[in-house]
């Protein structure tokens, strides 16, 4: 179309744009490694990075693994999405006790109410169930927990109230916050979800807490405890550690309690797309050499960093991964690892005080 | 550390309107599943519960007395309040205001030390 | 209402001792029932919650039992500082009530 010329015209000259004939206009050229969020990119923020599946890019522009809810008491609320991760929340009649970014550390099933009490509030995927006294003449057994919701206000709920079955062995696993489980109750293996809605208190046992020793009545030696397959971070929060589960990828150092799973790419790959303790892409490690070495650091430093290679080892040629993006590194098996903290956070739980200390570390906060 | 604390006229006259207030600390009253009560014992005697407040504003009260007690609370200020209308000398009392913590027991684990009140002409 | 039957109101013992005290229900409260302890000129103190469990705090000499109508709490090896009034308190159903109230004497 002659008519096109002029508009062609503008992007000639101008290595950072091109022509697109299919919308006729002047597009941004997204840098390499870069893809566009739109079919005609006008500017630097239209261009994003990447992500592999079950991957997502984070605030500081990381690929950073989707959590899963692979676990048999979590559901997916919302699916791991380009720029969000998955999030996870405690099945149906389970609540959140131990609250982990964009998942949940630890779910308890919901209190069943005691015999002759009522349900004032059902419980949800966050919150436990909340009970209350019958009414007078009114015989506990309403079909379902909605049926017993209260008025709003009133003297005395007209309601009809909950069923009254006990509690059983699998109802939860944690004592009430609020006092000492006897020895009769405990044989019976009754046990109760954590219910109290507050953390402030005489001192008692927090569902988010384990000692690590015997923890005296009002000592600080405990520390929060974290479910299985994940670690307690520098903000003291319960996070996922990620998962090596793929083909490529083989575990470098293990989930801890305090750090997480750190993944690689396995031997005779290298990694390409660099993700939060693990590589979002491993490539096949080329027959020569990359055209950036990594710079030996101390592991307490959170980001790799790259400088050219010395004089006289510039490779003969310049293999490039499928996007575009050079190899991070040069070694078989070595990853990037960037900062190790996603940005994207949930609130801390409220269960332990957690602070920092020199060392970067949780310390439980005893006061 | 959880504290709360009752305070109130101290002497009244029979028919008259008396409000008392429980301020606390250490807790909120917005928090999920926290409630506050207020229960009376007139000297010597046993505990008499009055009202409960719920986080969410729902209230409950003692049949026997409801068409005198109101209720009420200013969560961002920490208080809890009960108006009895139309005292009477059987109002005579220690009040308390107690909270309530347990989402499944409904038992006290705080209360205020009390205030005593008089009604008299 | 349901009422909170307490015996006995008064009584005698030793340190060292062992004392019950119960609350006879007028009607099922199951095990929804706490129990208090109160010192002159000071507010109450809770002791048990759901008829057997434990209050935070509370020395294990101190247990609840029974449920539906009878009630017992227990005090074994009694101390100086157990002198005090214990009353129950039902919260099966509105409105909650307490018992009358057992006062700890030293012999």
């Known amino acids: 179309f002659p008519q096109d010329r002029p508009f062609e015209d503008t992007c000639h000259g101008n290595p950072s744009h091109y022509y697109d004939k299919a919308v006729r206009r002047c597009c941004y050229r997204c840098p390499m490694g870069l893809f566009p969020t739109q079919q005609c990119p006008q500017r630097p923020t239209d261009c994003r990075k990447q992500c592999e599946p079950d991957y997502y890019l984070d605030e500081a522009d990381r690929c950073t693994a989707c959590v899963t809810c692979s676990r048999d008491d979590l559901v997916e609320k919302t699916p791991c999405a380009w720029n969000s991760s998955r999030v996870c929340e405690c099945r149906p009649g389970m609540f959140c006790s131990t609250s982990a970014v964009n998942s949940c550390a630890r779910c308890f099933f919901h209190s069943v109410c005691p015999a002759g009490m009522i349900v004032k509030f059902p419980g949800t995927a966050q919150k436990n169930t909340v009970c209350e006294p019958a009414s007078p003449g009114v015989s506990p057994a309403c079909a379902s927990p909605e049926n017993c919701k209260e008025p709003s206000s009133g003297t005395i709920p007209q309601a009809k109230p909950t069923p009254v079955s006990p509690a059983t062995s699998s109802a939860s696993t944690m004592p009430v916050r609020g006092g000492t489980r006897l020895a009769q109750e405990a044989a019976s293996k009754l046990t109760r979800a954590p219910d109290s809605p507050s953390s402030v208190g005489r001192p008692s046992s927090d569902p988010g807490l384990s000692p690590t020793q015997p923890c005296p009545e009002g000592s600080g030696d405990c520390r929060k405890q974290c479910e299985p397959d994940y670690y307690l971070d520098e903000a003291g929060r319960c996070t996922a550690c990620v998962s090596c589960s793929r083909d490529d990828l083989v575990e470098k150092t293990p989930c801890a309690w305090n750090s997480s799973r750190t993944c690689e790419c396995r031997p005779g790959m290298i990694c390409a797309t660099s993700a939060t303790n693990s590589c979002a892409r491993c490539v096949p490690y080329p027959i020569c050499a990359a055209e950036t070495v990594t710079k030996p650091q101390d592991m307490a430093e959170k980001d790799t960093t790259f400088e050219a290679p010395p004089l006289g080892t510039q490779p003969d040629c310049n293999p490039t991964p499928e996007n575009g993006e050079a190899p991070a590194s040069t070694s078989p098996t070595q990853s990037l690892l960037v900062d190790s903290q996603a940005s994207k956070t949930l609130p801390i739980p409220t269960s332990a005080p957690v602070a920092l200390s020199s060392t970067g570390k949780p310390v439980l906060d005893a006061g | 550390e959880v504290t709360l604390k009752v305070s109130g006229p101290g002497i009244s006259q029979p028919s008259q309107t008396l409000s008392l207030t429980c301020s606390f600390s250490?807790?909120?009253?917005?928090?999920?599943?926290?409630?506050v009560s207020w229960i009376r014992q007139p000297s010597g005697k046993g505990l008499e519960w009055l009202a409960h407040?719920?986080?969410?504003?729902?209230?409950r009260y003692n049949p026997s007395l409801k068409s005198r007690l109101t209720i009420s609370k200013d969560t961002s200020s920490n208080q809890v309040f009960l108006k009895i209308t139309s005292v009477d000398t059987a109002d005579t009392a220690t009040y308390y205001c107690a909270r309530r913590a347990e989402l499944r027991d409904f038992y006290f684990d705080y209360w205020g030390q009390g205030t005593t009140l008089t009604v008299s002409s | 209402d349901i009422v909170m039957t307490q015996s006995p109101k008064f009584m005698s013992t030793s340190v060292g001792d062992r004392v019950s005290v119960t609350c006879k229900a007028s009607?099922?409260?199951?095990?929804?029932v706490a129990w208090y302890q109160q010192k002159p000129g000071q507010s109450p103190k809770a002791l048990i919650y759901s008829a057997s469990y434990r209050y935070s705090g509370v020395p294990d000499r101190f247990t609840g039992s029974g449920s539906g109508t009878d009630l017992t709490l227990t005090i074994i090896n009694i101390q100086s500082e157990d002198l005090a009034e214990y009353f129950c308190q039902q919260y099966n159903t509105y409105p909650l009530t307490f018992g009358v109230g057992t006062k700890l004497e030293l012999k």
């Open positions: 407040i719920y986080w969410d504003d729902d209230k």
């Open positions: 009607q099922n409260v199951n095990t929804n």
């Open positions: 250490g807790f909120s009253l917005s928090t999920y599943g926290m409630g």
